[in-house]
């Protein structure tokens, strides 16, 4: 669809005559008829297949025609067509004399023709005007013409329909060839696809308008390139959504079980060396002069009974001093001036001469030690109990009192996390490398299946030993506030009593 535009510029009829040569009276009141049609090798009148248009009387005899387009007038003349412009045409321009105001053909004189011109040729669609001048023996007509596309039509032959829009169906303007040119921020064949915020992750982000970055489920961050870890993940990260990959030193489904108690809590005091020995368990190796589970107790240097052969120990600022009994000498009273003849072995020890009687050695009965069998054996000295267990002397033997979660003679064995049936309401317990996991029956949730869905989490009285239960409304779980002497998430473990020694 387009328009053939014809701009009449000047008509010269100096003698004021008709085509027949007859003079007009009083002058040739001139109007024009234009016929646009398909290309003909020899242009002849006939159906104006592309359109026809007439002007009013524009002047008498010779006159210039002013451009009326700005005022809504009829110059240039418009010959609209609603088909593909073929690129060729024929044009007939007739100048007629109208003695009166009625311009209908039947109202004109029978010889009213002043002049007729016929041209044909090729004409491409474009903004540029083609100037032409046609001269006959009596008249001259100067004019220009062009073909332009109608609004919303584009291309070499005005056949491409393109209507700019900025709505749900597209956001574009039209290029001269009719192709779409997307508005800033839009892309796609019909410019319906917004261009998201620069850097917005292709898979994990999307947008409904330009420069936006909305995250798909499981992703977060300005560019939707950060995964969201599992709900409740404490000390872990993710590489895909809902993962909980534990940080160094943490374990369990939610990475909330401390496997590196030493680093996270530094429990060992006074420069002791800390060794992790399992979930939330550790062993402190004390420096000389300290004792206690956390090496928190300062030892007197005499506490290690350094003086032998019954020597008495005296603390001094820079150490200690042994006062030796008669017959003994040396830093620790380790040298004897006695022999077996002096019966130096106590508690039934047997004396054996050494170095031709210059020295002796006592062979001690069980439960006694020392160079003179003067010391009762303390079987806890070597700290045989692992995982923070307390060593207790029991007559001729010893025993280890283990911390919760450990068992065995030396507390060397982890108790299975599932052994104490931690999953409530018939939940199934699964031992994991770093803890346990409960699979809950229908109607229950929580880490230990302790939460009745949509019911007060404390309704099942999960806390032991008369602990107070609080419901955490944000997570539908409970918290037990333990009375003195009990620990654990349900206050189920008694606190170990301080060790008592028989001497």
């Amino acid at each position: 669809s387009g328009v053939f535009q014809l701009q009449l510029q000047e008509f010269i009829n100096e003698r004021g005559v008709l085509a027949s040569g007859r003079p007009c009276e009083p002058g040739c009141r001139t109007f024009f008829r234009v016929c646009l049609k398909h290309f003909q090798a020899v242009v002849s009148p006939g159906p104006c297949t592309f359109g026809t248009v007439s002007t009013p009387v524009l002047g008498t005899n010779s006159f210039a025609v002013r451009d009326d387009s700005s005022g809504g007038g009829r110059n240039p003349l418009q010959l609209p067509f609603n088909f593909t412009w073929p690129g060729t045409f024929s044009l007939i321009i007739e100048a007629w004399h109208a003695p009166g105001d009625d311009l209908r053909p039947e109202a004109l004189p029978p010889d009213a023709l002043i002049s007729k011109i016929a041209i044909q040729g090729s004409l491409a669609v474009g903004q540029n005007w083609l100037l032409d001048e046609q001269t006959s023996t009596l008249t001259r007509l100067r004019y220009s013409y062009r073909v332009i596309c109608s609004d919303n039509y584009y291309g070499d032959n005005c056949s491409r329909l393109c209507k700019k829009r900025n709505d749900h169906f597209g956001h574009y303007v039209c290029q001269p060839d009719g192709n779409l040119s997307c508005l800033p921020g839009w892309t796609g064949e019909y410019c319906q696809q917004p261009i998201c915020l620069s850097g917005c992750h292709e898979q994990n982000g999307y947008c409904s308008k330009p420069a936006e970055c909305l995250c798909r489920p499981g992703w977060q961050g300005r560019l939707c390139n950060e995964c969201i870890p599992h709900n409740g993940c404490r000390h872990g990260t993710c590489s895909t959504p809902w993962q909980c990959t534990c940080d160094e030193g943490w374990g369990g489904l939610f990475c909330d079980q401390d496997l590196n108690y030493c680093t996270h809590h530094s429990p060992c005091k006074n420069g002791a060396t800390c060794s992790n020995s399992g979930q939330r368990s550790y062993t402190c190796t004390c420096r000389p002069g300290y004792t206690g589970v956390d090496c928190e107790l300062e030892l007197s240097e005499c506490d290690s009974n350094p003086c032998r052969n019954g020597g008495s120990c005296k603390d001094q600022e820079d150490g200690y001093h042994c006062l030796c009994p008669p017959g003994y000498y040396g830093l620790h009273c380790e040298h004897s001036t006695l022999s077996c003849a002096d019966s130096p072995c106590f508690n039934g020890g047997s004396c054996r001469e050494r170095n031709q009687g210059a020295n002796y050695a006592c062979e001690c009965p069980p439960n006694f030690t020392g160079s003179n069998c003067e010391k009762k054996v303390d079987r806890c000295t070597s700290n045989p109990c692992a995982n923070g267990g307390q060593c207790l002397n029991r007559g001729p033997s010893r025993m280890c009192r283990c911390r919760p979660g450990f068992t065995g003679t030396y507390c060397e064995l982890h108790v299975s996390d599932c052994a104490r049936n931690p999953c409530a309401h018939g939940g199934t317990c699964h031992d994991l490398e770093n803890g346990l996991m409960c699979t809950c029956p229908a109607g229950f949730s929580g880490r230990r299946c302790e939460v009745r869905t949509s019911i007060d989490a404390c309704a099942s009285s999960p806390c032991f030993n008369r602990a107070t239960c609080y419901t955490d409304l944000s997570t539908d779980t409970f918290v037990c506030n333990c009375p003195y002497g009990f620990v654990g998430s349900r206050c189920e473990f008694p606190v170990g009593l301080p060790p008592s020694f028989p001497w």
């Epitope: 008709l18 085509a19 007859r22 007629w96 053909p105 029978p110 010889d111 023709l113 007729k116 006959s136």
Partner: antibody, heavy 119, light 106 residues
Framework: EVQLVESGGGLVKSGGSLRLSCAAS????????MSWVRQAPGKGLEWVAI????????YSADSVKGRFTISRDNSKNTLYLQLNSLRAEDTAVYYC????????????WGQGTMVTVSS | SYELTQPPSVSVSPGQTASITCSGD??????VSWYQQKPGQSPVLVIY???QRPSGIPERFSGSNSGNTATLTISGTQAMDEADYYC?????????FGGGTKLTVL
Amino acid sequence: EVQLVESGGGLVKSGGSLRLSCAASGFTFRSHWMSWVRQAPGKGLEWVAIISYDGSNKYSADSVKGRFTISRDNSKNTLYLQLNSLRAEDTAVYYCAKAGGGNVGFDIWGQGTMVTVSS
Amino acid sequence: SYELTQPPSVSVSPGQTASITCSGDNLGSQYVSWYQQKPGQSPVLVIYQDAQRPSGIPERFSGSNSGNTATLTISGTQAMDEADYYCQAWDRSGVVFGGGTKLTVL
């Protein structure tokens, strides 16, 4: 039906006069130019005279100038041709014709009336 | 005065194309009309404004006009087309007819 009917022809002596009439019907007579065309026996068509729709403009061939007069009465839808000073060479069939506006030519013709001039 | 010249006669076989010419000085600048006249009948307008056909005139009649010559063309000529044909234009004095051409269909 659009129709033109001529009358008034006949035999007349040289130097004599005749008045031809053309009665129009079936179209708006007062809106159209009208003309007379003659055809001598065995010859071609020859234009005689033409008159504008209101009678204000009249043109005639050089061969009849000063002798023949064209006129019209729009109230009677009638065209006239007054023939004076007739000559032998004026012997012909005289046709009344309606002239189409804007170089259309003569689109309606009467059946003709014969004028014979004897010497 | 202005003159239009036609050939006195043209012959054509039935079904063939007949062309009748009309010559005049710068005739292409004017509109030409053509008339058909059969013996004993009034003339009938068959072409006006060079190439236009009045209603009722068969499509086999066509016309053209350029330069100094106008042409009436009858394609697929029939016996009923046998007649005298006249061209007509205008000069400063009034109407001008050509001398006429007798078309014979053999």
